[in-house]
Interface confidence: medium
Amino acid sequence: VLEVYYTHLRCRCVQESSVFIPRRFIDRIQISPRGNGCPRKEIIVWKKNKSVVCVDPQAEWIQRIMEMLRKKSSSTPPVPVF
């Protein structure tokens, strides 16, 4: 079971999945950088079926998406949450 904590504590991902999620199933991705109470980099994926998944930041597929988003954001105005 994948868990995301929503508490006064700042780290939200207990477990992370490296399982590929097709882009058509992804609603949005939130990247929480290290710091601000959680020393861990966390990537949280909101799926279109309303489920929430913490993704292993080292997973190759999410790194490819992140790289694509970085390239996209460098050519367009930045948005707060992808």
Partner: antibody, heavy 119, light 107 residues
Framework: EVQLLESGGGLVQPGGSLRLSCAAS????????MSWVRQAPGKGLEWVSA????????YYADSVKGRFTISRDNSKNTLYLQMNSLRAEDTAVYYC????????????WGQGTLVTVSS | DTQMTQSPSTLSASVGDRVTITCRAS??????LAWYQQKPGKAPKLLIY???SLASGVPSRFSGSGSGTEFTLTISSLQPDDFATYYC?????????FGGGTKLEIK
Amino acid sequence: EVQLLESGGGLVQPGGSLRLSCAASGFTFGNSWMSWVRQAPGKGLEWVSAISGSGGSTYYADSVKGRFTISRDNSKNTLYLQMNSLRAEDTAVYYCTRDLPGIAVAGYWGQGTLVTVSS
Amino acid sequence: DTQMTQSPSTLSASVGDRVTITCRASEGIYHWLAWYQQKPGKAPKLLIYKASSLASGVPSRFSGSGSGTEFTLTISSLQPDDFATYYCQQYSNYPLTFGGGTKLEIK
């Protein structure tokens, strides 16, 4: 009751290798971030490494990066620390710790295992 | 890396005393600070996290305060069981770092 039991410590020569194990019980191991913290004789505490519940994310202190590897086997409820290229300054008691949920703080500690690096 | 500095390194006190230990961070860490107690030959024990939140089972005579770069651990009335070494630790960012420790000894 949360229990963490380290093993695998001992005397090793400089440049040698050692693998520490930590057997966990009393909680859902696969849902817990785990860490290793060490303490040289008569000295203070030093954080060594941390690993996520799934094992996908790992972090290391600069002093051990490239030499130590943290891993886990959730089917065996066991945490590991593979230590290579050991140096005299790695001599310490190594503690296995379980983080509190959602916070990078060691809420539970094992009793420790002593690693001595000496020729 | 965030450096943590504790003072004093040694503190002599008597049973019933009120004692305060200080921990300073080299950069702002908000309130992401924990305190541990360690007795000789034993593993450390978590006392306080988030600067002032008491860990489960910790007596109320222990309290923590502070934010940013300066933090304190206070023991309102020392008990014989409290003579130990105390460490602060920041968890704002990896690498997690500890203070050098404060040894609380009997006067």
